[in-house]
């Protein structure tokens, strides 16, 4: 049975040209995290593999930095970066946990972080 929950940074906003940290945290499970995938809609941004370390997708290398921790830093933001981001925790023996973050990139200086919130755990089905 999957008992874990993922806490994410939730709905966040940031200024065009700035940076933002995407963070997820898996708790309430003793499952071993074998890999974390970061995805934006239909594209892999980065992978952190427990054995092999961090690897940034070639098409995002200039704008994505690993960390802090299992999080991801997006740099040089554009309005096209607005949208859904997913942290996908591959674990053993539980399976897959998915967290969702919505990022809005704003033109002006009104950007501010949304409140942290918890989303229920679920298996990642497609």
């Amino acid at each position: 049975m999957m008992t874990g929950t993922i806490e994410t940074t939730g709905n966040i906003s940031a200024e065009k040209g700035g940076s933002i940290i995407l963070q997820c945290h898996l708790s309430s499970t003793t499952a071993q995290v074998t890999q974390v995938n970061w995805e934006q809609q239909d594209q892999l941004l980065a992978i952190c593999n427990a054995d092999l370390g961090w690897h940034i997708s070639p098409s995002f290398k200039d704008r994505v930095a690993p960390g802090p921790g299992l999080g991801l830093t997006l740099q040089s933001l554009t309005v096209n970066d607005t949208g859904e981001y997913f942290c996908i925790y591959h674990t053993y023996p539980d399976g897959t946990y998915t967290g969702r973050i919505f990022l809005e990139v704003l033109e002006s200086s009104v950007a501010e972080h949304g409140a942290r919130f918890q989303i229920p755990h679920h298996h990642h089905h497609h």
């Epitope: 074998t34 890999q35 995938n37 995805e39 239909d42 594209q43 892999l44 992978i47 593999n49 054995d51 092999l52 370390g53 690897h55 997708s57 070639p58 098409s59 591959h90 990642h124 497609h126």
Partner: antibody, heavy 117, light 107 residues
Framework: QVQLQQSGAELVRPGTSVKVSCKAS????????IEWVKQRPGQGLEWIGV????????NYKEKFKGKATLTADKSSSTAYMQLSSLTSEDSAVYFC??????????WGQGTTLTVSS | DIVMTQSHKFMSTSVGDRVSITCKAS??????VAWYQHKPGQSPKLLIY???YRYTGVPDRFTGTGSGTDFTFTISSVQAEDLAVYYC?????????FGGGTKLEIK
């Protein structure tokens, strides 16, 4: 230019072990993964495992755990794959490849292993 | 493990034809798919990575599309030198499994 030079063909007896080498040149050895791939005669490509030469971290396909052991020597920019308890099922061409996790961009020429009594 | 299925083991085509090879993942792999060309007696060559990005120096007649579970590799105008086996491979999670391969035969 980037090159991966593999050791030569091997003819070995069942039950023995063999160590295949893959010498890298033309790039920073510790900045890329080294992946290993098996191809049996008339068959497709099968991923064996991968090593991060910088950290020494390894990851294997389950069926090759206990069969293959991946190591890397940073001082000589050489990766190794040791195969143990050899049987006829291990007769194949083995490739090493430079990996960026998301793809394998340079490949060795392949090492043919024949296991026969 | 993620299973990558290439439904056609063989495909027959003529020079100048357009040909598409399909690959289906057993579960979501985002765009974490690469395509390789393997000619007899040679090492495999990378053609496409991240489902749709053409690797450096690869002719533009080779293209890739897809995301999620369904992927397609297309040669827009087949040349005689394209005779080879083509493999998809997923890089979404280890083990980095290959498809069974599709052998392109020239009529």
């Amino acid at each position: 230019q980037v090159q991966l030079q593999q050791s030569g063909a091997e003819l070995v007896r069942p039950g023995t072990s063999v160590k295949v080498s893959c010498k890298a040149s033309g790039y920073a050895f510790t900045n890329y993964l080294i992946e290993w791939v098996k191809q049996r005669p008339g068959q497709g490509l099968e991923w064996i495992g991968v090593i991060n030469p910088g950290s020494g971290g390894t990851n294997y396909k389950e069926k090759f755990k206990g069969k293959a052991t991946l190591t890397a020597d940073k001082s000589s920019s050489t990766a190794y794959m040791q195969l143990s308890s050899l049987t006829s099922e291990d007769s194949a061409v083995y490739f090493c490849a430079r990996g960026e996790y998301f793809f394998f961009d340079y490949w060795g020429q392949g090492t043919t292993l024949t296991v026969s009594s | 493990d993620i299973v990558m299925t290439q439904s056609h083991k063989f495909m027959s085509t003529s020079v100048g034809d357009r040909v598409s090879i399909t690959c289906k993942a057993s579960q979501h792999v985002s765009n974490g798919v690469a395509w390789y060309q393997h000619k007899p007696g040679q090492s495999p060559k990378l053609l496409i990575y991240s489902a749709s990005y053409r690797y450096t120096g690869v002719p533009d007649r080779f293209t890739g599309t897809g995301s999620g579970t369904d992927f397609t590799f297309t040669i827009s105008s087949v040349q005689a030198e394209d005779l080879a086996v083509y493999y998809c491979q997923q890089h979404y999670n280890t083990p980095h499994t290959f498809g069974g391969g599709t052998k392109l035969e020239i009529k």
